[in-house]
């Protein structure tokens, strides 16, 4: 079951999936001036059996001006930096991707890929949040959101991470705790 909405946006934070549940789709989007090859896939699909999950289909882009197909290569660093949905400013390791059965890793980049990846998540997907540069976590609580099915509709849980700038936190006394990997998770909501 696909999630109806995107994961919630919260102030001064970005999110990333550490692994993608089977059924997740990634649009084959090309950057400006390029398009999908004529017989190319519309999306990549995370599929698998009981022991192994992987991405089906390959995304391929070709110049809008020519008919040449392209090979899979790693983009230049400046291109990678722009992929805001899938890249974060500093590493996050709440989960070892390889240790999650029924999940795919981050797909490798393809040549002339669009700057932002568009994923279509499925129920049960978890994404993790981190404060952007210049902001810090007010508290070390769970920093994730889960797509859940409730009353026949999908919704993402509200992330509990609060990111504040130095000026904002100065008026709040109390010990600052470092942001940690989530232990308690705000996902055990009772379904109907």
């Amino acid at each position: 079951e696909l999630c109806d909405d995107d994961p919630p946006e919260i102030p001064h934070a970005t999110f990333k999936a550490m692994a993608y549940k089977e059924g997740t789709m990634l649009n084959c989007e090309c950057k400006r001036g390029f398009r999908r090859i004529k017989s190319g896939s519309l999306y990549m699909l995370c599929t698998g059996n009981s022991s192994h999950s992987s991405w089906d289909n390959q995304c391929q882009c070709t110049s809008s001006a020519t008919r040449n197909t392209t090979k899979q290569v790693t983009p230049q660093p400046e291109e990678q930096k722009e992929r805001k949905t899938t890249e974060m400013q500093s590493p996050m390791q709440p989960v070892d991707q390889a240790s999650l059965p029924g999940h795919c890793r981050e797909p490798p980049p393809w040549e002339n890929e669009a700057t932002e990846r568009i994923y279509h998540f499925v129920v049960g997907q978890m994404v993790y949040y981190q404060c952007v540069q210049g902001y810090r976590a007010l508290h070390r609580g769970p920093a994730e959101s889960v797509c859940k099915m409730t009353h026949g509709k999908t919704r993402w849980t509200q992330p509990q991470l609060i990111c504040t700038g130095e000026m904002e936190t100065s008026q709040f006394p109390g010990e600052e705790k470092p942001q940690a990997s989530p232990e308690g998770r705000p996902e055990s909501e009772t379904s109907c």
């Epitope: 919630p8 946006e9 919260i10 102030p11 007010l138 508290h139 609580g141 769970p142 509200q158 509990q160 609060i162 504040t164 904002e168 936190t169 109390g174 705790k177 308690g184 998770r185 705000p186 996902e187 055990s188 909501e189 009772t190």
Partner: antibody, heavy 116, light 107 residues
């Protein structure tokens, strides 16, 4: 079903102490911020601050800092709002809500009346 | 703190009317805005979050729009159940703040 149930209405005299409660159910109470909101008679909503029940980390709005105390007991999924010395100006309806950003679930409110 | 100013403070309307309430922030809040409905003697109810996302179970006649520092709540066709007070709340800059409220009353 997610629910926040608050303790009943209170009538107190100035200078008395008071502790009101908010009990959560139907979700992982310890792992969601609880927000406290004040509404004085005939007035709007005021954001008082938040508490994280898992470790009772608290943050107060500057307007309420030093005026009230938040606490929580995660073992019984309950958050508390207390005053050590009530004033007539504390007369209001107090709501607990589930946060931290927007409040998707609210308690029914506790009316606190402070009068000599 | 960011100040939130709603207008009008009171709005008289009839069933079936299209109603618009405005909320202005004292600085840009990047769409981190929620709208609530409150009826007398009841707790507020979340209608809209992230400026335009409709909360589950809220009728589609309610919609939110806006960006930057100016936002609107629109009720496309006012129903008898919609006469209430409406509040906006920003959650962009800690601490969060509410608007003063807009009362929608029967004309």
């Amino acid at each position: 079903e997610v629910q926040l149930v608050q303790s009943g209405a209170e009538v107190k005299k100035p200078g008395e102490s008071l502790k009101i409660s908010c009990k959560g159910s139907g979700y992982s109470f310890a792992n969601y911020w609880i927000v406290w909101v004040r509404q004085m008679p005939g007035k709007g909503l005021e954001w008082m601050g938040i508490i994280y029940p898992d470790d009772s980390e608290t943050r107060y709005s500057p307007s309420f800092q030093g005026q009230v105390t938040f606490s929580a007991d995660k073992s019984i999924s309950t958050a508390y709002l207390q005053w050590s010395s009530l004033k007539a100006s504390d007369t209001a309806m107090y709501y607990c809500t589930r946060g931290p950003y927007y409040s998707d679930y609210w308690g029914q409110g506790t009316l606190v009346t402070v009068s000599s | 703190d960011i100040q939130m100013t709603q207008s009008p403070s009171t709005l008289s309307a009839s069933v079936g009317d299209r109603v618009t309430i405005t909320c202005r922030a004292s600085q840009i809040i990047s769409g981190y805005l929620a709208w609530y409905q409150q009826k007398p003697g009841k707790a507020p109810k979340l209608l809209i979050y992230k400026a335009s996302s409709l909360e589950s179970g809220v009728p589609s006649r309610f919609s939110g729009s806006g960006s930057g520092a100016e936002f609107t709540l629109t009720i496309s066709s006012l129903q008898p159940d919609d006469f209430a007070t409406y509040y906006c709340q920003q959650y962009n800059s800690y601490t969060w703040t509410f608007g003063q409220g807009t009362k929608v009353e029967i004309k």
